[in-house]
């Protein structure tokens, strides 16, 4: 069952997601000037089981110019779980940021890929606030969303996040993208997909902070 | 596959100038962060800059303010990270990196901070002389 409406806006503030709960899928969108390779694939589908998830079917996009000839050619699903994890990231990035279980990380970009990015959710699924650049945030609890069942309907919970205009001054380099728990929040076993765009509402960025005032920027 | 490719990397004296480029080919730049992250041996890594493909929006740790200038050129697929009055300090390697925009094609400082990035390049070495 889709989920009736798109994540709460918060004023001055914005909102995505770091993980997508397995049954996600993801259109295969692309840029103007581009569309599918003929026979690939519509959507991609974040699939799994308890130690391993990732993402089904690969995104290609190739110029509307051409006929079925050259096309832009992203890696197989796996390739990209395995590149996100090891080949493409640096020394610097931290290990097992792909270890959440039961979800997939974001696909790595594609190229010619839409601007948007439309995903299903299902329920369960976290977006996580933060507050855009010259606003400080103030919240006193979670400052993310998640989609739940309650009797037989789905909603999206608020986040208790308030951005204040108030200038930010502080960088806080601690600040981390936690990692989202997924038996963190109670779930109906009833799947819930919902359609939504990147830029309308983003999956699960977890960015809460421990304190109960911290600054954070939109950039 | 989608690639992030640095260059500009080099010896310079303090006092100098470098100009880092990172290509990359494909990438729809208006859904995307893109920046520059360092890390110099033995210390944390840091993202030093990123720029916002769908406004512009530009961001810079403290310790660059002023001195580094972050650009875009969509139609070439490439970010160049201007460097100028460098310092030993600077001296580390630079990696270029894309992250996702949230909703409205809006983008947080944190998550830049966070180093949680969607995709990286390898690298270019960058060593400033006293």
């Known amino acids: 069952e889709l989920c009736d409406d798109d994540p709460p806006e918060i004023p001055h503030a914005t909102f995505k997601a770091m993980a997508y709960k397995e049954g996600t899928m993801l259109n295969c969108e692309c840029k103007r000037g581009f569309r599918r390779i003929k026979s690939g694939s519509l959507y991609m589908l974040c699939t799994g089981n308890s130690s391993h998830s990732s993402w089904d079917n690969q995104c290609q996009c190739t110029s509307s110019a051409t006929r079925n000839t050259t096309k832009q050619v992203t890696p197989q699903p796996e390739e990209q779980k395995e590149r996100k994890t090891t080949e493409m990231q640096s020394p610097m990035q931290p290990v097992d940021q792909a270890s959440l279980p039961g979800h997939c990380r974001e696909p790595p970009p594609w190229e010619n890929e839409a601007t948007e990015r439309i995903y299903h959710f299902v329920v369960g699924q976290m977006v996580y606030y933060q507050c855009v650049q010259g606003y400080r945030a103030l919240h006193r609890g979670p400052a993310e969303s998640v989609c739940k069942m309650t009797h037989g309907k789905t909603r999206w919970t608020q986040p208790q996040l308030i951005c204040t205009g108030e200038m930010e001054t502080s960088q806080f380099p601690g600040e981390e993208k936690p990692q989202a728990s997924p038996e963190g929040r109670p779930e109906s076993e009833t799947s819930c997909l919902v359609t939504t765009t990147d830029f309308q509402i983003q999956t699960e960025m977890a960015a809460t902070m421990e304190t109960s005032i911290f600054t954070t920027e939109y950039q | 596959q989608l690639q992030l490719v640095e260059s500009g990397g080099g010896l310079v004296q303090a006092g100098g100038s470098l100009r880092l480029s990172c290509a990359a080919s494909?990438?729809?730049?208006?859904?995307?962060?893109i920046g520059w992250f360092r890390q110099a041996p033995g210390k944390e890594r840091e993202g030093v800059s990123y720029i916002t493909g769908s406004d512009g929006t530009t961001y810079y740790i403290n310790s660059v303010k002023g001195r580094f200038t972050i650009s875009s050129d969509n139609a070439k697929s490439t970010v160049y990270l201007q460097m100028n009055t460098l310092k030993p300090e600077d001296t580390a390697v630079y990696y270029c990196?894309?992250?996702?925009?949230?909703?409205?094609?809006?983008?947080?400082?944190?998550?830049?901070?966070?180093?949680?990035?969607?995709?990286w390049g390898k690298g270019t070495q960058v060593t400033v002389s006293s």
């Open positions: 990196a894309v992250d996702r925009l949230g909703s409205q094609g809006r983008y947080a400082s944190a998550w830049w901070r966070s180093g949680d990035m969607d995709l």
């Open positions: 494909g990438l729809t730049f208006e859904g995307y962060a």
